[in-house]
């Protein structure tokens, strides 16, 4: 199988993971997209997904995960706010394209969250950020219940990923949790 590349993000508790997953806009603009976690020896699990069809720039929030799909740009933005040590793991962006298997975007993200004070509270960006608010009205989309005939013994090819039921979305926080993100200059 093709070796999948990983991009390591090392962040502190309380910071925000902010990932931009690019896609070919002519092909995938309105396709449903998802953010998944891959645990050792398990199928990827869907934590959050966009609506179907995906709505342009419309934020979808599941707990501390926010997805924004920018059709005009061919870009899916994924944010995980108020990171916790237990969020550490391997993640990926995928595009659902039934009946085919999902198409993986970008490199996989190896997230390492450590304890300790973060120099840039609430974000992995630098101090250029002077306004940062979680949108007050977001939607929780229902993710498809995909299964794959392939058993996971090795990494799948670069362009595909396996998906299973999105039962892990509650592992981060309940959707009703209050999210506090500092506004700073």
């Amino acid at each position: 199988a093709t070796k999948l590349t990983e991009e390591k993000y090392e962040l502190k508790e309380g910071q925000t993971l902010d990932v931009k997953c690019d896609y070919t806009l002519e092909k995938f603009a309105s396709s449903q997209k998802a953010w998944q976690i891959i645990r050792d020896g398990e199928m990827p699990k869907t934590l959050a997904c966009t609506e179907r069809p995906s709505k342009n720039s419309h934020p979808v929030q599941v707990g501390r995960i926010i997805l924004e799909d920018y059709h005009d740009h061919g870009l899916l933005r994924v944010r995980m706010v108020n990171l916790q040590v237990e969020d550490s793991g391997l993640y990926q962006c995928v595009i659902y394209q039934p009946p085919k298997e999902p198409h993986m975007l970008f490199d996989r993200i190896r997230l390492v969250v450590t304890k300790g004070f973060s120099g840039t509270p609430g974000s992995n960006e630098n101090s250029t950020q002077n306004v940062y608010k979680i949108p007050p009205t977001t939607t929780k989309a229902l993710c498809p219940l995909y299964t794959s005939p392939r058993t996971v013994t090795q990494a799948p090819p670069k362009s595909t990923a396996d998906v299973s039921t999105p039962d892990s979305e509650i592992n981060l926080t309940n959707v009703t949790d209050i999210i506090r993100v500092p506004v700073f200059n």
Epitope: E7, K8, K20, D22, Y23, N56, S57, Y70, D72, H73, G74, L75, F106, D107, N124, E125, N126, T128, Q129, N130, V131, Y132, K133, P135
Partner: antibody, heavy 116, light 107 residues
């Protein structure tokens, strides 16, 4: 067709102010991040600032922080850059661009000259 | 701040030949890299995003590759309209940063 038309450039003395505007058409302005990018004469490109659709996120390059303010009016499809305490090194063509991270569409630019 | 370095500063190529432009990031930018073309007296134009995805309307002779810190823009067969300055730009993190540019000139 996407159109971005900048205005408001000109000659200003050091320490002075200018307000640049950008009229956008041909796309759904309110669904797009917008940015300003500048280019000093004979030099390369420099990102200046970006603003989210609802202005809930705004970013600036350190060199202009505290002096420049990016804003938008979605009702009028317009983007603005208020530039205060201008310096000679701010002399550049300022481009209005569609996008907040990478830039799909560019205006033709407006020249800002800071000189005494 | 992520520093983007382009090489060479100037590339002299004959029409019909292949041109290879390099861009290096001071730290990994994953695939969050774009390439722009700027002709004299004109605004830049987006060519490639996501390191390898051609923007709408860009001819197939333009291709991008790379990930992490090393990226390449290849123009397979230079046409007269391709002589211009090319910039790379990272968008993994703010502040967004551009390379210094590579001027592709007629040999």
């Amino acid at each position: 067709e996407v159109q971005l038309v900048e205005s408001g450039g000109g000659l200003v003395q050091p320490g002075g102010s200018l307000r640049l505007s950008c009229a956008a058409s041909g796309f759904t302005f309110s669904s797009n991040w917008m940015s300003w990018v500048r280019q000093a004469p004979g030099k390369g490109l420099d990102w200046v600032a970006s603003i989210k659709q609802d202005a809930s996120e705004i970013y600036y390059v350190d060199a202009v922080k505290g002096r420049f303010t990016i804003s938008r009016d979605n009702a009028k499809n317009s983007l603005h850059l208020q530039m205060n305490s201008l310096r000679a090194e701010d002399t550049a063509v300022y481009y209005c661009v569609r996008g907040g991270w990478r830039f799909e569409s560019w205006g033709q630019g407006t020249l800002v000259t800071v000189s005494s | 701040e992520i520093v983007m370095t382009q090489s060479p500063a100037t590339l002299s190529v004959s029409p019909g030949e292949r041109a290879t432009l390099s861009c290096r990031a001071s730290q990994s930018v994953s695939s969050n890299l774009a390439w722009y073309q700027q002709k004299s007296g004109q605004a830049p134009r987006l060519l490639i995003y996501g390191a390898s995805i051609r923007a709408t309307g860009i001819p197939a002779r333009f291709s991008g590759s790379g990930s992490g810190t090393e990226f390449t823009l290849t123009i397979s067969s230079l046409q007269s309209e391709d002589f211009a300055v090319y910039y790379c730009q990272q968008y993994k993190n703010f502040p967004l940063t551009f390379g210094g540019g590579t001027k592709v000139e007629i040999k």
